[in-house]
């Protein structure tokens, strides 16, 4: 166990051209605060992934008002360290994210507004118990100077805070097998580190690396409850048996406790023992309150002011997560209808609609025929966001303005010849065929294949069908 400590030295414009504008103004005074997020290992994880080693918020800095005409100076900082307690071993390699937040103190409806000014990230190697490490990181035109260290909490010592120490029993030397506990030379190392993952509730050790179980528990990490309900009666060759161990799946399998919490099984379910700074059924809630301003991106904090009461962040549109820290890809919900193109502008969502559609979400189907005339007696037909003209005989084109050649499509079957006519077209049929398009054969006996002759006509009469 131990504490990671972060000291912010300065936050202000970086060197070089393009100095940033001051984040505060006479009309909108503001103050800064910082958030640090730690993850074990040299991970390349996204900013939204959990801060598995822990996270902390600083206090608010002094209120700052820009002096008109003056360049942006280093901004006034909060007092004190940011401290992230860690329960287990210090991993030695870690990733960090440090965010600089601005709290605007103008006449905001519903309280102050928060916005992210800068975010820096890095991956470092660090031994616990070492000196302060200094660092400079740049984010755009801003520069952040800070120091950090990891220190162990007694009785833990060592570069990973896994060694325990005890006072020397004799002034000159440690007991058998025990080394001096550098740098505490007056103490001796206590080699009582159990097997990794050994259940704190059901296991213990007297030798390094062992895990001995509470009676009623079994398994290499003492996480499996012993059941004797399915035991066979001790008969025959196994008469020396007094019972059997039937490991059943436990509610702690897979460790449901987050943030380094340890799981213990209860008669009905499980209970998480949470590290300092976390609480909740699964240690999913950090011990911050609304007074700490844990809701980012303008989220509204609701909850008690005492450490035992949780808070809930009500996020503004476009953000989600327990602290409103995640930007929602609002276009992934496909809010634009009728094939509209979605644009997430951050402060708002826009839909670029296809022709024939309108509205914030392209939900309105425009009257495609409104104000559109089809020439030469054509009629307008709506559909698919575009208008179409159904043209009168003899005309074609989008607006029926083109005179159509009715014979272009060769409409007369069986070698009939096509003639353009004011009312459309006329087919002169080849011998043996009849009909408007010469589609019906004439039988040799003079009977046609027509199912019935039109009224007033006898089958076999020479005719034209128009």
């Amino acid at each position: 166990a131990g504490v990671f400590e972060l000291q912010i030295h300065s936050f202000g414009p970086g060197p070089g051209p393009g100095a940033p504008r001051s984040p505060c103004s006479a009309r909108l005074p503001c103050r800064l605060f910082f958030r640090v997020c730690l993850k074990p290992g040299l991970s390349e994880e996204a900013a939204e992934s959990p801060c598995a080693l822990g996270a902390a918020l600083s206090a608010r800095g002094p209120v700052y008002t820009e002096q008109p005409g003056a360049p942006a100076p280093d901004l006034p900082l909060p007092d004190g360290l940011l401290q992230v307690p860690f329960r287990d071993a210090w991993p030695g390699t870690f990733s960090f994210i440090i965010e600089t937040w601005r709290e605007e103190l103008g006449d905001q409806i519903g309280g102050p507004a928060w916005s992210l000014l800068a975010r820096v990230a890095g991956r470092r190697r660090l031994a616990a118990g070492g000196p302060w490490a200094r660092d400079i990181q740049r984010a755009g035109a801003w520069e952040l100077r800070f120091s950090y260290r990891a220190r162990c909490e007694p009785p833990a010592v060592g570069t990973a805070c896994t060694r325990l120490c005890r006072p020397r029993s004799a002034p000159s030397r440690c007991g058998p097998g025990l080394r001096p506990c550098a740098p505490l030379e007056d103490e001796c190392e206590a080699p009582l580190v159990c097997r990794a993952g050994c259940s704190p509730e059901h296991g213990f050790c007297e030798q390094p690396g062992e895990c001995r179980c509470l009676e009623g528990w079994t398994g290499p990490l003492c996480t499996v409850p012993v059941s004797t309900s399915s035991c066979l009666s001790p008969r025959g060759p196994s008469s020396a048996t007094t019972g059997c161990l039937v490991p059943g799946p436990g509610p702690c399998d897979g460790n449901p406790c987050a943030n380094g919490g340890s799981c213990s099984e209860t008669p009905r379910s499980f209970e998480c023992t949470c590290p300092r700074g976390f609480y909740g059924l699964r240690c999913e809630v950090s011990g911050v309150t609304c007074a700490d301003g844990p809701c980012f991106n303008g989220g509204l904090c609701v909850g008690g002011a005492d450490p035992d009461s949780a808070y809930i962040c009500h996020c503004p549109p476009g953000f989600q997560g327990s602290n409103c820290e995640k930007r929602v890809d609002r276009c992934s919900l496909q809010p634009c209808r009728n094939g509209g193109l979605c644009l997430d502008l951050g402060h708002a969502l826009r839909c670029r609609c296809r022709a024939g559609f309108a509205g914030p979400r392209c939900e309105h189907d425009l009257d495609d025929c409104a104000g559109r005339a089809c020439a030469n007696g054509g009629t307008c037909v709506e559909g698919g966001g575009a208008h179409r003209c159904s043209c009168a005989l003899g005309f074609g084109g989008r607006d029926c303005r083109e005179r159509a050649d009715p014979c272009a499509a060769r409409p007369c079957a069986h070698g009939g010849r096509c003639y353009a006519h004011f009312s459309g077209l006329v087919c002169a049929c080849a011998p043996g065929y009849m009909g408007a398009r010469c589609e019906f054969p004439v039988h040799p006996d003079g009977a046609s294949a027509l199912p019935a002759a039109p009224p007033g006509l006898r089958p076999g009469d020479p005719q034209r069908y128009l």
Partner: nanobody, 117 residues
Framework: QVQLVESGGGSVQPGGSLRLSCAAS????????MGWYRQVPGKPRELVAT???????NYATSVKGRFTISRDNAKNTVYLQMNSLRPEDTAVYYC???????????WAQGTQVTVSS
Amino acid sequence: QVQLVESGGGSVQPGGSLRLSCAASGIVFNSDVMGWYRQVPGKPRELVATITGGGSTNYATSVKGRFTISRDNAKNTVYLQMNSLRPEDTAVYYCNGRRGDSMLAFWAQGTQVTVSS
């Protein structure tokens, strides 16, 4: 430095009761799992009962229903109330805890509990 001091042991007849106390100094243990252990000469030490920071308890099968573990985080103290004591409960009782994968402290002197008629 971390120190755990057990007290409250003594001699008692079968069926009697004792209350053991363990006071911790040099550490704030309110988030640590604390436990009572016992050892009979010539046998390995065994875990008797544990209590989490939130007050959830676990007991060895042999003491369930007879022993009760509790803690007072404000006083940095953990207790073991032992009722209906049996001769097989005779042992040296120790207090210790767990923090992460480590034991919280070195084993202290312990307190002797003797149950005999």
